[in-house]
């Protein structure tokens, strides 16, 4: 139970954080003009990602899209790759443990199968929530460094009496975001590596179990194999059960093979 | 169509206070800010503030802070403007005007002369 | 505070001429994040308000002749006027709306030689 439980928790974690890079990697406050010196302004700029964005008093707010790809900062092509990177894999990572889950039945899947697929998805969550991570970080960094460039040549004079005040830019909500979401699809994916060594099963202890069926004789094997008299030989109608071993934390319902909780 | 329709002329004595008034229509009146301009005769054009009617928010130029107070009264679709301690360089008209985009002001009112004479 | 410095402070041309007027901001109007600059150009008529011309340097507001156009960029910016009409005389104004407070350059007055 407590192995469901962990595995179960990790995907949530790690489907929120996932949801949280998306969104993080749309948002276009990834960095916003600093306004310490002047809380009150009548333009005001901010960035992400993909375009940069002007409030403006009035109330109006127009955007530019980078409609360039060479024209670019190497920096920001490198956090876009690993935003990019990151969701990729975090979606992957989704896909493959949803079919892990062992609160899913899908078909005659052994425990060390899901065991494997817990693992493969959480070490793809681990270096999804790792390269978002990275990937904020390194646009704070670069934010950081252009904030104290811009502050030594606050006023680049043009001689005479025209000055231009270059635009300081500060961390937006989407480093925030980007850190949050990194740091949960993290924790998600180590607490799907933590449920994979409950998964894996150490022995298998098969029970022996007699069944007796009225009117035909009806075998059943361990493994989830049916042996049946014939194909006509049920001809009163009766389910023939998929009867295969299971071990004590399975719950079986019937008649559906996809048993979702 | 967009009318600001502002009040009457006002004839002030040093060291009172008038307010003047400004009836928006025309347009969703809580979804634009609304500018005040004065100019003196003969002279250019002087910023004073805005106000959001939404929110009464206000930016005000600073030269203006103690002069100016402007208000809102959504449910006339109303702006004011309260000038105290009147004197006699606080003689002008007294234009409000919507804000458009570019922080550019798109419709203007017709003005309303404020005279501060002893 | 930005200022605005407008230059000639009078121009007279004649009928069907190009008029031109200057604008100097005493700092960039140039907004980084949308790379618009914050210039708006005004026209006012004797005993009437100032009537909108263009905003962001270059656009026309609606219903403005396109005989009126404005150019420049970041602090040096131009309005003109390529075929003046009769009834274009009046006082032009240019305006900072780029950071507060908004201000306004001195004015140019148009005339007909």
């Known amino acids: 139970m407590a192995v469901t439980a962990c595995q179960g928790l990790g995907f949530v974690v790690s489907l929120i954080g996932i949801a949280g890079i998306i969104a993080a990697t749309c948002m276009d406050q990834w960095s916003t003009q600093d306004l310490y010196n002047n809380p009150v302004t009548a333009v005001f700029n901010y960035q992400g990602l993909w375009r940069s964005c002007v409030r403006e008093s009035s109330g109006f707010t127009e955007c530019r899209g980078y409609f360039t790809l060479l024209g670019l900062p190497a920096m920001l092509q490198a956090v876009r790759a690993l935003m990019i990177v990151g969701i990729v894999l975090g979606a992957i990572g989704l896909l493959v443990s949803i079919f892990a889950l062992k609160c899913i039945r899908i078909g005659s899947m052994e425990d060390s199968a899901k065991a494997n697929m817990t693992l493969t998805s959480g070490i793809m969550f681990i270096v999804s929530g790792l390269c978002a991570i990275a990937g904020v970080s390194v646009f704070a960094n670069m934010l950081v460094t252009n904030f104290w460039m811009s502050t030594a040549n606050m006023y680049t004079g043009m001689g005479g009496m025209v000055q231009t005040v270059q635009t300081r830019y500060t961390f937006g909500a989407a480093l925030f975001v980007g850190w949050v979401a990194g740091g949960l699809t993290l924790i998600g994916g180590v607490m799907m590596c933590i449920a994979c060594r409950g998964l894996a099963p150490e022995e298998t202890n098969y029970k022996a179990v007699s069944y007796h069926a009225s009117g035909h004789s009806v075998a059943y094997k361990p493994g989830g194999f049916k042996a049946s008299t014939g194909f006509g030989s049920n001809t009163k109608n009766k389910k023939i059960y998929d009867g295969g071993a299971r071990t004590e934390d399975e719950v079986q319902s019937y008649p559906s093979k996809h048993d979702y909780v | 169509q967009v009318q600001l329709v502002q009040s009457g002329a006002e004839v002030k004595k040093p060291g009172a206070s008038v307010k003047v008034s400004c009836k928006a229509s025309?347009?969703?009146?809580?979804?634009?800010?609304v500018n005040w301009v004065r100019q003196a005769p003969g002279q250019g054009l002087e910023w004073i503030g805005m106000v959001h009617p939404s929110g009464s928010e206000t930016r005000l130029n600073q030269q203006f802070k103690d002069k100016a107070t402007l208000t809102v009264d959504t449910s006339t679709s109303t702006v004011y403007m309260e000038l105290s301690s009147l004197r006699s360089e606080d003689t002008a008209v007294y234009y409000c005007a919507r804000v458009w985009s570019g922080n550019a002001f798109d419709y203007w009112g017709q003005g309303t002369l404020v005279t501060v004479s002893s | 505070d930005i200022v605005m410095t407008q230059s000639p402070d009078s121009l007279a041309v004649s009928l069907g001429e190009r008029a031109t007027i200057n604008c100097l901001s005493s700092q960039s109007l140039l907004a980084s994040g949308n790379q618009r600059n914050y210039l708006t150009w005004y026209q006012q008529k004797p005993g009437q308000p100032p009537k909108l011309l263009i905003y962001?340097?270059?656009t026309r507001d609606s219903g403005v002749p396109d005989r009126f156009s404005g150019s420049g960029s970041g602090v040096d910016f131009t309005l003109t006027i390529s075929s003046v009409q009769a009834e274009d005389v009046a006082v032009y104004y240019c305006q900072n709306g780029f950071s507060f407070p908004f201000t306004f350059g001195q004015g140019t007055k148009l005339e007909i030689k």
């Open positions: 962001w340097a270059s």
């Open positions: 025309g347009y969703t009146f809580t979804n634009y800010w």
